[in-house]
Each structure stands twice: as C-alpha cells, then as structure tokens.
C-alpha cells in the first residue's frame, strides 16, 4: 500500500522537516528558516511560534518541531501549551483588571495566582479559631469550645505565626 501510495503521490515520501515543493517538480525541499513540518508528506511548512515580550523561549524551533514558550518571570502560563501569560501577584493579593489588589478582610490567597477565598468558618464544624487568618493564610480551626471546658484536657494554642487578620484598607 505504501508503495502504491508513493507512486500515486510523490509527496508522501517527503519526511518531517521538509515540504513537497510544487515549484520544483514535487521535490522534497527543506523547510526554510523559522519554519517546520512535524509530519511527512506536507505541502507547506508551518511558521515557527515566536516567543517574545511576555513570552520567552522554552524550546527552540527546529525543522521538525515548533518552538515552545513559557512566560517571562513575573508572569505565569495559562491555557494549553502556554497560550497566554498572566501577571503574578504577591500572596495576600488577587489579580483584577486594575492589577494586583490586596485581599479584602476575611479572605486570603496563599499563592501568586488565583483569587482571594473566604477564611474557613470554624463554627460550621463546631470548632473554634485556633490561629487567626491573614491576607496570606486561612484561619486554623482548633477543638470545639466544649472540648476546652474545665476538666477536659487543655490545648495550649501555639503563638500566632503572623499578625491577626488586618483591618479593611
């Protein structure tokens, strides 16, 4: 079948990294600079992806494979194959159309991306707040108030690692 196909279509013999050049009697010509063909039998080579500005090159383009981009430091990838770059924020912030903004009181974000999320409501689980929340960290829930009643084994709360929840700005 392969032999039959190649008799019918001489282009099928052109390997990856080349294209079937109609201007030269369907001879297999190498892909020009800054282009590639990742499969055989191609009639054109594809233009290499350019990683510039918000993008930087993770893998150079070759005659048989496209360039791969990631994001310039300060930004992170979004989408399949890093199709977009989005600004990083600091912990305790979220990205809005106005740029990075501090989390509102009662919310936190412990990452450089994503949105501020509400602190855990310890009382919903019948627990008490052991360590207050901050812009960067969720609250830590401790034993239920009943567990701390006289006679029960007491738990000494650890000293807070950070300042308690900040006031609205």
């Amino acid at each position: 079948f392969e032999r039959t196909r190649s008799l019918q279509d001489p282009c099928s013999n052109c390997p990856a990294g080349t294209f079937c050049d109609n201007n030269r009697n369907q001879i297999c010509s190498p892909c020009p600079p800054n282009s590639f063909s990742s499969a055989g039998g191609q009639r054109t080579c594809d233009i290499c992806r350019q990683c510039k500005g918000v993008f930087r090159t993770r893998k150079e383009c070759s005659s048989t494979s496209n360039a791969e981009c990631d994001c310039t430091p300060g930004f992170h990838c979004l989408g399949a194959g890093c199709s977009m770059c989005e600004q990083d924020c600091k912990q305790g912030q979220e990205l809005t159309k106005k740029g990075c903004k501090d989390c509102c009181f009662g919310t936190f974000n412990d990452q450089k991306r994503g949105i501020c999320r509400p602190w855990t409501n310890c009382s919903l689980d019948g627990k008490s707040v052991l360590v207050n929340g901050t812009k960067e960290r969720d609250v830590v829930c401790g034993p239920s108030p009943a567990d701390l009643s006289p006679g029960a084994s007491s738990v000494t709360p650890p000293a807070p690692a950070r300042e308690p929840g900040h006031s609205p700005q």
Epitope: G53, V54, F75, L78, G79, S83, M84, C85, E86, Q87, L95, T96, K97
Partner: nanobody, 123 residues
C-alpha cells in the same frame, strides 16, 4: 499573521516626556483589551496599564498613575502610552500586549506581544 510593533522609545532626562506607539496588524484590533507591560534591567516583567476595547476603561499600576496615559485609536489600529514626569525607575523595555480571548471576564492573560521599545531615563 498577528503582529504588534512598538516604537517611540529613546533616551530622556528625568522629568521629561515620551510617547510610545504600538501598531497592530493581522487581527481586529477593536475586539481586544490592550496592555502595556515593561521589564526593567535585571527585573521581572511588570504590568503597566490596560485599556478596554472601546477605550471606556483604563487602569494603571500605582507607580505610574497620574503620570502615564494609555489611549488607543481603533481606526488606526494603534495603541499609545503617553509618559510624563519620567523617573529613572521607569527605565525599561516596554511591550504592548493583547489581552487574550475572555480577558477581564475569567482571566487577565495576554496572548500576543511585540518585540518592545527601550526607554532610558537618565541625566
């Protein structure tokens, strides 16, 4: 082919002004949010300003608010950044970047940017 080309950079003294331009081709410019971002020598990339498709919303990073003005001319497929009261810390490579599909709704990702234009503020 989608392309953004920046121009207008140069050497300017502190307190001076400069106007950057970005010319877009290969896509419907008026359908996209546009951004300016910059990278100072040895630093990470920093978002500077953005502008909505029709120019009705504009936002700035705090450090340039009141000094820089972003604008666009959809008829000319052009984006601008008017920079006044320039400081040495504004020295950077400036890039224009297109907001990706859905920008402002569920993400603030940028999917195309240019080669950049260099701004140097020095006495």
């Amino acid at each position: 082919q989608v392309q953004l080309v920046e121009s207008g950079g140069g050497l300017v003294q502190p307190g001076g002004s400069l106007r950057l331009s970005c010319t877009a081709s290969g896509f419907t410019f008026s359908d996209y949010w546009m951004n300016w971002v910059r990278q100072a020598p040895g630093k990470g990339l920093e978002w500077v300003a953005n502008i909505k498709e029709d120019g009705s919303e504009k936002y700035y990073v705090d450090s340039v608010e009141g000094r820089f003005t972003i604008s666009r001319d959809n008829a000319r497929n052009s984006l601008y950044l008017q920079m006044t009261s320039l400081r040495e810390e504004d020295t950077a490579m400036y890039y224009c970047a297109r907001g990706g599909e859905g920008y402002g709704d569920n993400h603030y990702g940028m999917d195309v940017s240019g080669q950049g234009t260099t701004v140097t503020v020095s006495s």
